[in-house]
């Protein structure tokens, strides 16, 4: 069951794993629901009655049975992971804990304007796991207004103590908010020299990059492969650091890949969760289970829907058929299986089973990063949860209709285009609707998200001249579904990827005089380069702000009704919004592409409106 | 952990100079300020100067002509020289990490005597 | 220059006693003094920071108290091995400064 509730003065006696800090009740619940075997936890809060070493120890705690027995305590405050529970994990901590000392290891010390400035200075150092900031009225005045930036072994704090006129907090790179270098490529037969920091088993290297990834201290890494000569070593996944941040020295192997943590890549961290079954392979770890099933997406359900199952192998069993020879039955054994760490203790090949992981840390995920199967005028209807971050904005003055699309990109963000707001007076006469596929399902009763504010770009004039892009802040905040989640923006790091499966979609018209669509249409379209748009557009200027996509046989294109929808394309399984629906001249006609706001431009615009002020 | 060690000459000459290592382990220089305290025998404590991990410094007035403090980040190690040493230079000389202008770890000391 | 000044250069105590010693600044240092504690052949131990915060692994038995320009730190009941000097020191500006010390003997 999935218990969100906090108990407080109470204490889960027994059971404990591990003890650290953290400098409040929430964050404990956080660090225990990405522990490997943390069930349940008991914060010590401040408390007059409690021995103030002991306050902010987080204890982490598991029990065989899922509970353990509560106690009375004044100051303690338990709770259960949200491992149990359906609902997105986010890592992702930006609270500022005023008169709070996070003890770490200091490693840098500058001064600073402000504690979101120390903060962003943290989130943009490769090392930097929390801060601490002396404020302006701090009694020291050489250490007035000083950030120091701390790292420590696990990534949380050693001690957290009581501090007048200090401010402390964490990293937002797991808020997808670092400015450092994203290097998503894989290097093949590389292995690196740099000192390991931690080593684990893993079938494959892309299990080597995501452990490494969500590692507080790993930078980069190097898996060594089931065909690498030295037997005790396959399978190994290295992880690895170094005081620049980057690896030292490269050196060629067959049997090696080496890689990058993802941890600094805006919206695109993978998540621990591998979803592949890995055949002809049997992990070892300490036996939790074993239960009959058909087949292995069976084995791997029951372990995902087993708590404490961390992976699992499925061996087939080999029965005669009725024509008498061997075969592999569908009906198996199901080991489930768990480890100190995660990861399997051993990796075996060539006994027949078949492994995996659970798939419960799948949630965990950075929500715009869901593998999503994919694949408007000349375009194709769209199936239901296709495109899970396009809404439709209904204005509902003087009557209610369709206005424009829009992208959500965050719980409380929809971003979409400037120019859908001439008419606009009030955000009040603005709906969006999301996890709509036809515009018929909306009726009276239909649940919709008012909009608290509309941002538009204050260089928008027009959308031929370009800033053709507006923020929606909605007035509550919205729960991820299949059907409505968002996009990943693209990052600034990412401007070389050349993206080949690019979509737009919308409910617009499918010919220039037409009507709204009914069902969200979407059309495949290549992008074209600046150059050949500017060709096609004489009378005006293509900006680096701009994008253009379409076929020059027209055919397939945004219209009237699309705009402010996504340009959503694919790079490595992870869709990226590239543009926004803007402008054209007609729709789809021969040499005339649509031109669409480029994002990737206005991605620190984006980024400084939706902070919390 | 957090260790501090000072190595000094031991003895020297008035109107020489003095140079003091202070090397660290445990922390690194770039995160945290390094102090100078000396303590003549028999007597108190005094605050000579220190090092910030920026590499700022300041120094105690009386002494501001004749000190300075340096560090080599790379190899944890801060230096402070003195010169026109006097015989009432003579004392223990500590290095210390600061924690927020106090000090929370202190080396053993190394002793130095000033005389002919 | 900031000067402290601790008016007792030795106090007299005996195991169980309350024993409170003071420093004076010449200026006013906020709450940034601290008091160190100094035992024959040994280096400085930090006590107390920011005039009241206990550093790690310090005995709740030791206590500070104060603000501006008058500081005292106090031990509530006096052990054996507390019989050493204790010295104030501001660290509102630099130069940073120390008081002369106090030294705790047995009565």
């Known amino acids: 069951d999935c218990v969100t509730k906090l108990f407080k003065d109470t204490l889960f006696q027994g059971g404990d794993i591990s003890t650290v800090f953290t400098p409040s009740a929430e964050h404990c619940q956080v660090v225990c629901t990405h522990h490997p075997r943390c069930l349940l936890f008991t914060f010590m809060a401040e408390s007059p009655t409690e021995d103030p070493t002991k306050w902010f120890t987080c204890v982490l705690k598991d029990s065989i049975t899922e509970t353990l027995p509560k106690v009375n305590m004044s100051g303690a405050i338990s709770g259960y992971s949200f491992k149990q529970c359906p609902h997105q994990i986010n890592a992702c901590n930006n609270h500022l804990y005023v008169d709070l000392d996070m003890k770490g290891m200091n490693y840098k010390d500058s001064v600073a304007k402000s504690a979101h400035e120390c903060q962003e200075r943290c989130t943009n150092d490769i090392h930097c796991h929390f801060f601490t900031y002396a404020t302006w009225s701090f009694p020291s005045e050489q250490h007035r207004n000083v950030c120091l930036l701390k790292y420590t072994q696990m990534g949380t704090p050693t001690r957290i103590m009581k501090i007048n006129e200090v401010v402390s907090g964490f990293s937002l790179k797991s808020c997808a908010l670092s400015n450092l270098a994203c290097i998503r490529d894989i290097f093949p037969r590389t292995g690196f020299a740099d000192s390991n920091i931690d080593s684990v088993l893993v079938p494959d290297v892309f299990v080597c990059q995501s452990i490494c990834t969500h590692h507080p201290n790993c930078l980069f890494f190097t898996f060594l492969s089931k065909d690498w000569p030295k037997e005790s070593e396959r399978n190994l996944c290295l992880l690895k650091s170094s005081l620049s941040g980057l690896p030292s020295t490269r050196y060629g192997k067959d049997n090696a890949f080496s890689g990058f943590s993802l941890q600094n890549c805006r919206h695109s961290v993978p998540v621990l969760c591998h979803s592949s079954f890995y055949p002809d392979t049997d992990f070892l770890g300490e036996e939790l289970d074993i239960v009959d099933v058909e087949g292995r997406e069976a084995c791997q359900k029951v372990c995902t829907d087993t708590l404490r199952c961390q992976f699992f192998t499925y061996s087939p069993s080999q029965q005669p058929s009725n024509k008498g020879n061997l075969f592999p039955s569908c009906r198996g054994k199901c080991y489930l299986k768990l480890s100190l760490n995660g990861s399997p203790t051993k990796i075996l090949h060539g006994r027949g089973g078949i492994s995996g992981y659970t798939l419960r840390l799948c949630k965990m995920d950075n929500v715009c990063t869901n593998r999503i199967n994919a694949r408007i005028v000349g375009g194709t209807a769209s199936v239901y949860s296709e495109w899970p971050w396009q809404i439709t904005l209904h204005t509902t003055s003087p009557t209610q209709r369709h206005l424009c699309g829009g992208s959500i990109i965050g719980n409380q963000w929809i971003l979409t285009a400037a120019h859908c707001f001439i008419e606009v007076d009030s955000p009040k006469i603005l709906r969006v609707y999301s996890g709509i596929l036809n515009q018929s399902e909306i009726k009276e009763d239909t649940t919709f998200f008012g909009v608290q504010e509309i941002i538009i770009h204050d260089q928008y004039k027009m959308a031929e001249s370009g800033y053709d892009i507006a923020l929606l802040k909605l007035e509550t905040t919205m729960n991820y579904t299949d059907f409505q989640r968002p996009i990943c923006l693209p990052s600034k790091s990412d401007r070389n990827i050349t993206y080949t499966e690019c979509w737009v979609t919308g409910w617009g018209y499918r010919k220039l005089r037409d009507k709204i669509q009914n069902t969200l249409q979407k059309a495949k379209v290549p992008l074209i380069t600046n150059d050949e748009c500017q060709t096609r557009y004489t009378g005006h200027k293509i900006t680096n702000k701009m994008v253009c996509a379409g076929y020059k046989e027209g055919g397939r294109d945004a219209c009237k009704g699309d705009s402010g929808g996504p340009l959503s394309c694919k790079h490595k399984e992870v869709w990226y919004l590239v543009g926004i629906t803007s402008w054209g001249e007609g729709c789809a006609q021969s040499g005339r592409p649509g031109v669409y706001t480029n994002v990737i431009e206005y991605v620190d615009w984006i980024l400084e409106k939706t902070q919390p002020a | 952990q957090v260790q501090l060690e000072e190595s000094g000459p031991g003895l020297v000459a008035p109107s020489q100079s003095l140079s003091i290592t202070c090397t660290v382990s445990?922390?690194?220089?770039?995160?945290?300020?390094i102090y100078w305290v000396r303590q003549p025998p028999g007597k108190g404590l005094e605050w000579l100067g220190m090092?910030?991990?920026?590499?700022?410094?300041d120094y105690n007035s009386a002494l501001k002509s004749r000190l300075s403090i340096s560090k080599d980040n790379s190899k944890s190690q801060v230096f402070l020289k003195m010169n026109s040493l006097q015989t009432d230079d003579t004392a223990r000389y500590y290095c210390?990490?600061?924690?927020?202008?106090?000090?929370?770890?202190w080396g053993q000391g190394t002793t130095l005597t000033v005389s002919s | 220059d900031i000067v402290m000044t601790q008016s007792h250069k030795f106090m007299s105590t005996s195991v169980g006693d309350r024993v409170s010693i003071t420093c004076k600044a010449s200026q006013d240092v906020s709450t940034a003094v601290a008091w160190y504690q100094q035992k024959p052949g040994q280096s400085p131990k930090l006590l107390i920071y920011?005039?009241?915060y206990r550093n790690t692994g310090v005995p709740d038995r030791f206590t500070g108290s104060g603000s501006g320009t008058d500081f005292t730190f106090t031990i509530s009941s006096v052990q054996a091995e507390d019989l050493a000097v204790y010295y104030c020191?501001?660290?509102?500006?630099?130069?940073?400064?120390f008081g002369g010390g106090t030294k705790l003997e047995r009565l």
């Open positions: 445990g922390f690194s220089l770039t995160g945290y300020g």
């Open positions: 210390a990490r600061d924690y927020y202008g106090s000090k929370d770890y």
């Open positions: 920011l005039t009241s």
């Open positions: 090092i910030w991990g920026d590499g700022r410094t």
């Open positions: 020191q501001q660290h509102y500006k630099t130069p940073y400064s």
